[in-house]
């Protein structure tokens, strides 16, 4: 807290300028008008104030706006934003994407701070949903943002926003998050032609059901093994040998290297050995010829 003292004669600041860096903390408090500061916030960034001086300026704004700063001030906070606490930010009503970008720019290159996380949450809640422009902005600054949202929060992402998602934005997502995102991506990209559609949908396929994988197998997509290994095991198990062969195309040979790993391992156990032999890859572990295959899940449901 800065003590209240009268401003010395001739030191009253007519505007926010470089001369203020020579003011002591008590002089800034006494001689800078808070309303003037608010209207000339854009100038603060260009002046090399010390951290202690910035504390005084923040204190003046806090006194002027005890209920929270208006967006006209927030947009021009610049480095003063780093002085804000999450509690300060919870009082704000930020609606402009330009304001959000300006403040994210201040924090650029640093890990997401509690202040930034609070700002983003306030902004997204204020908008009601993660629209495409917001998602575009957030993933540009923080590629892992999407994967830190819960499946419930992701359910509020409109399909149109999926166009903003890049493959690297999904790198750290878990299967339940992809379960939510995949149907949205399918809807977003539904009007694209076969090969273009596959390029776009590929990163989301960890959430795809069996019927969609079967449909893809009819489209000559040549899925690579890395994508295949990320598919849901329960979605892969019902696929026939012929369907997997069509789905992978020339990449089918990669199954041999992955035969001990999920979902390939579990899929092999479900196939007839003579069907596996048709691939000519030496895959072992299928159901021996002549054995009867019982659907135990069906049997359990009946008993």
């Amino acid at each position: 807290e800065v003590e209240k003292t009268a401003c010395p004669s001739g030191k009253k600041a007519p505007e926010i300028d470089e001369s203020l860096i020579f003011y002591k903390k008590w002089e800034l408090e006494a001689c800078v008008d808070a309303a003037l500061l608010a209207t000339q916030m854009d100038r603060v960034n260009a002046i090399p104030f010390t951290y202690e001086q910035l504390d005084v300026l923040k204190h003046k704004l806090d006194e002027l706006y005890p209920q929270g700063y208006p967006e006209s001030v927030i947009q021009h906070l610049g480095y003063l934003f780093l002085k804000m606490s999450p509690e300060d930010i919870r009082k704000w009503n930020v609606t402009s994407l330009e304001t959000l970008k300006a403040l994210l720019e201040v924090n650029k290159g640093h890990e997401m701070s509690p202040q930034v996380a609070t700002l983003i949450d306030r902004f997204v809640k204020g908008r009601g949903q993660l629209d495409k422009d917001t998602l575009d902005t957030l993933t540009a600054f923080y590629p892992g943002y999407l994967c830190s949202l819960s499946p419930e929060e992701l359910s509020s992402v409109p399909p149109s926003s999926i166009w903003a998602v890049r493959p690297q934005d999904l790198d750290t997502c878990d299967p339940r998050q992809l379960d939510v995102l995949y149907p949205k991506a399918r809807l977003a990209f539904q009007n694209m032609n076969g090969s273009e559609y596959f390029v776009k949908i590929q990163s989301f396929l960890g959430g795809a059901p069996t019927e969609d994988l079967k449909a893809l197998s009819q489209q000559n997509v040549s899925m690579d093994l890395a994508t295949f290994m990320k598919l849901r095991t329960d979605a892969v198990l019902p696929l026939t040998v012929a369907e997997v062969q069509k789905l992978l195309g020339p990449h089918v040979e990669g199954l041999k290297a992955e035969e001990r790993h999920r979902p390939v391992r579990d899929w092999i156990l479900r196939q007839r050995q003579d069907d596996l032999d048709t691939l000519g890859l030496g895959l072992q572990g299928g159901i021996p010829n002549g054995y009867l295959v019982l659907d135990l899940s069906m049997q359990e449901a009946l008993s």
């Epitope: 999450p86 890990e111 997401m112 701070s113 509690p114 930034v116 996380a117 609070t118 983003i120 949450d121 923080y142 590629p143 892992g144 943002y145 994967c147 830190s148 949202l149 819960s150 499946p151 419930e152 929060e153 790198d171 750290t172 878990d174 998050q177």
Partner: nanobody, 115 residues
Framework: QLQLVESGGGLVQPGGSHRLSCAVS????????MRWYRQAPGKEREWLTS???????AYADSVKDRFTISLDNAKNMLYLQMNSLKPEDTAVYYC?????????WGQGTQVTVAS
Amino acid sequence: QLQLVESGGGLVQPGGSHRLSCAVSVSTFTRYAMRWYRQAPGKEREWLTSIYSDGSSAYADSVKDRFTISLDNAKNMLYLQMNSLKPEDTAVYYCNANVDSKAYWGQGTQVTVAS
């Protein structure tokens, strides 16, 4: 830089219960998805469960009714309660944090289920 340190690994009887802990080095994060994964010998890393900043959680089908994830914010600890353990649960267990948009991994702790 956030650090994760797992503990609680060891030998457990089949059918028994066990709890793993993961100490999180900072407490100031706001948005997160904390997860447990495991990796059995010669197998790929497998996702087990996640807990998110809105308090919700999600589970892989293989552990849905047996494992429970929880987070003690006051102690900065992530837990994995494992019940009805089977020999096929033998693996190195890793905690993972997607915290404020960055991903971090612990070094892992070995759990062996055998009589």
